[in-house]
């Protein structure tokens, strides 16, 4: 049997809505023929299901086999190194992969200007892998919230923060002109999920956007 292979040092999930990726770190001194076996356990079934016998990458997209994540008690995954006839012990994820582990994101943020207000519309994620009935708003049906960060250019680090409870929001610009840049981070008040800040969206506000009233 020769020398034992060491186990992958760490195994963990990183996930967004219907984008569930398993990661692991490589064993020390792996050879060109080293690969990794991935197995998955669904809570309630209690038997390990082999997903990949020999992955040469250090991550694996498990979305397709965890589509019921949002209606289940979650999963554990395990990974072991394989090199020819030798294999290591399994390294198991040390937390349960459940809906709570999914990082919340937004699809996009659209901005427009109306009478001195910036009107924002948050588009929710619409991943192709999601079953038709499993929309973001049906899974997270209550207590959706969004932190809004507003930056005025020039003045790179003058931030205003605001929390809103709807996908549509408005920002009063107090008559200021210039470029306003907005980022959004989603959360669900009743949950502990982390949120990822969106990419910045910017819009220019000039005098022409203000209505003159007598």
């Amino acid at each position: 049997h020769g020398t034992e292979l060491p186990s992958p040092p760490s195994v963990w999930f990183e996930a967004e809505f219907f984008h569930h990726i398993l990661h692991w770190t490589p064993i020390p001194n792996q050879s060109e023929s080293t690969c990794y076996e991935v197995a998955l356990l669904r809570y309630g079934i209690e038997s390990w299901n082999s997903i990949s016998n020999c992955s040469q990458t250090l991550s694996y997209d498990l979305t397709a086999v965890t589509l019921d994540l949002y209606h289940s008690n979650g999963y554990r995954a395990r990974v072991r190194a394989v090199d020819g006839s030798r294999h290591s012990n399994w390294t198991v994820t040390n937390t349960r992969f459940s809906v709570d582990e999914v990082t919340l994101t937004v699809g996009s943020v659209n901005l427009e200007i109306h009478n001195g207000f910036i009107l924002g519309k948050i588009q929710l994620p619409r991943p192709k892998m999601a079953p038709a009935n499993d929309t973001y708003e049906s899974i997270f049906s209550h207590f959706r919230e969004y932190e809004i960060a507003i930056r005025k250019v020039p003045g790179n680090f003058t931030f205003t923060h605001k929390k809103v409870k709807h996908e549509n929001f408005s920002l009063l610009t107090s008559g200021e002109v210039g470029e306003f840049c907005v980022q959004v981070k989603p959360s669900v008040a009743s949950r502990s999920n982390k949120g990822m800040w969106s990419k910045e969206e910017c819009i220019s506000l000039t005098r022409q956007y203000f209505t003159v009233t007598n």
Epitope: L58, F157, K185
Partner: nanobody, 124 residues
Framework: QLQLLESGGGLVQPGGSLRLSCAAS????????MGWFRQAPGKGREFVSA????????YYAESVKGRFTISKDNSKNTLYLQMNSLRAEDTAVYYC?????????????????WGQGTMVTVSS
Amino acid sequence: QLQLLESGGGLVQPGGSLRLSCAASGRTFSAYGMGWFRQAPGKGREFVSAIRWYGEGTYYAESVKGRFTISKDNSKNTLYLQMNSLRAEDTAVYYCAAKTRPDSYLSEKSYGYWGQGTMVTVSS
């Protein structure tokens, strides 16, 4: 907006050492991990090393394994790359990047924010 600022580059002799730093500034820092990439003159950008931001886990390119060490200070939102036993072929612009997608740590596409880069020259 998240901004990444690298420092610590410079001219060093073969066999020497440098420590690169990358400070993440801005009130909207969120990332799965952080990474270092490099681009040698006339070549494409290549992966050097990466680290999970929350939890344990590091990755290294084969060419730097055993010579480079990646580390982080979460309280300062700062990433480091200790580079020892430097070689002429390590000469490149080194970029810090924040991983904003759940995909592979080794892929540029997983990283949504990039620094401007710091030049490392290894020459006698």
